[in-house]
């Protein structure tokens, strides 16, 4: 079925929501004053070999659990990330965006990445797809 303007708009809104969530996480942790940043950077994330289509969000979905574990270190009284809720929201968006009709096997790059590199990669992906929709 060809994408309608309403489905394109919905996809764009979902991607913008995903983008905002990823940017919020990055801004929350990537602060040189964050006491835990250096230790958070010791965690490694798998990066997609290729990320150009919505189906490639499978690669993000598979790394959401490790992401939640690292975000559990990032809380403070004035910065309520609530990792479980945040990751749950991202998971819902990712599932809707990538669709469940076809099974896609994610291919990962050989080199692992830090949480900052990982988030930046998926932020760039979201921005890129949004730009093709507008």
């Amino acid at each position: 079925m060809a994408p309608t303007s309403s489905s394109t708009k919905k996809t764009q809104l979902q991607l913008e929501h995903l983008l905002l969530d990823l940017q919020m996480i990055l801004n929350g942790i990537n602060n040189y004053k964050n006491p835990k940043l250096t230790r958070m950077l010791t965690f490694k994330f798998y990066m997609p070999k290729k990320a150009t289509e919505l189906k490639h969000l499978q690669c993000l979905e598979e790394e959401l659990k490790p992401l939640e574990e690292v975000l559990n270190l990032a809380q403070s009284k004035n910065f309520h990330l609530r990792p479980r809720d945040l990751i749950s929201n991202i998971n819902v968006i990712v599932l809707e965006l990538k669709g469940s009709e076809t099974t896609f096997m994610c291919e990962y790059a050989d080199e692992t990445a830090t949480i900052v590199e990982f988030l930046n990669r998926w932020i760039t992906f979201s921005q890129s797809i949004i730009s093709t929709l507008t």
């Epitope: 006491p35 250096t38 010791t42």
Partner: antibody
């Protein structure tokens, strides 16, 4: 019982290499960072560096960078601290400790018993 | 690196005494409303043991006679009624900035 058990005391000559160990038990070793702390005779405590046993990622105190290497083998729940060429000034007690950083905190909740390293000609 | 200055460096006290140890940081160890300051006890020939984390939280299993307070740059460890097993060296530690640093220690001896 959650514990970290370190290898026994070592007596070495200057220039020799050494690798001491810290074995975790009673918890998921890969899920917690392990830190190394030095205590020179009659002195205070100095943080050396940290390893994430799950990923192998490390971070060092600038003072110890290039002087020691921190590694881990998660399959046997063990972290290591090694020297390629010991100096007399490396004589100290070395502790491994488990880092806890969930929520609003960052502290060492479990410590190894310590490994005494003596370097003398 | 953040410097932690403990005072006094050592003192003598008797069982039952109220003991106060201070730790002053060269800059704030607070981050977004939380104090990244911990206290450890070390007995001769033994590894340090966690007493207090995040300035005022008592570690599980540590007697309630130990308490911690403070924020920013000034912190205090208090032992409300000194017991024989409390004669040891006490260290404060900041975990707000790398490298993590410890105070020089305060040795509590029997009078």
């Amino acid at each position: 019982e959650v514990q970290l058990v370190q290898s026994g005391a070592e007596v070495k000559k200057p220039g020799e290499s050494l690798k001491i160990s810290c074995k975790g038990s009673g918890y998921a070793f890969s899920n917690y960072l392990i830190e190394w702390v030095r205590q020179m005779p009659g002195k205070g405590l100095e943080w050396m560096g940290v390893i994430n046993p799950g990923s192998g990622g490390t971070y060092y105190n600038e003072k110890f960078k290039g002087q020691v290497t921190i590694s881990a083998d998660k399959s046997i729940s063990t972290a290591y601290l090694q020297w390629s060429s010991l100096k007399a000034s490396d004589t100290a007690m070395y502790y491994c400790a488990r880092w806890r950083g969930e929520g609003y905190y960052a502290y060492y909740d479990v410590w190894g018993q310590g490994t005494t390293v003596t370097v003398s000609s | 690196a953040i410097r932690l200055t403990q005072s006094p460096s050592s003192f003598s006290a008797s069982t039952g005494d109220r003991v106060t140890i201070t730790c002053k940081a060269s800059q704030s160890v607070d981050y977004q409303g939380d104090s990244y300051l911990n206290w450890y006890q070390q007995k001769p020939g033994k590894a340090p043991k966690l007493l207090i984390y995040a300035a005022s939280n008592l570690e599980s299993g540590v007697p309630s006679r130990f308490s911690g307070s403070g924020s920013g740059t000034d912190f205090t460890l208090t032992i409300s009624s000194l017991q024989s097993e409390d004669f040891a060296t006490y260290y404060c530690q900041q975990s707000n900035e790398d490298p993590y640093t410890f105070g020089g220690g305060t040795k509590v001896e029997i009078k």
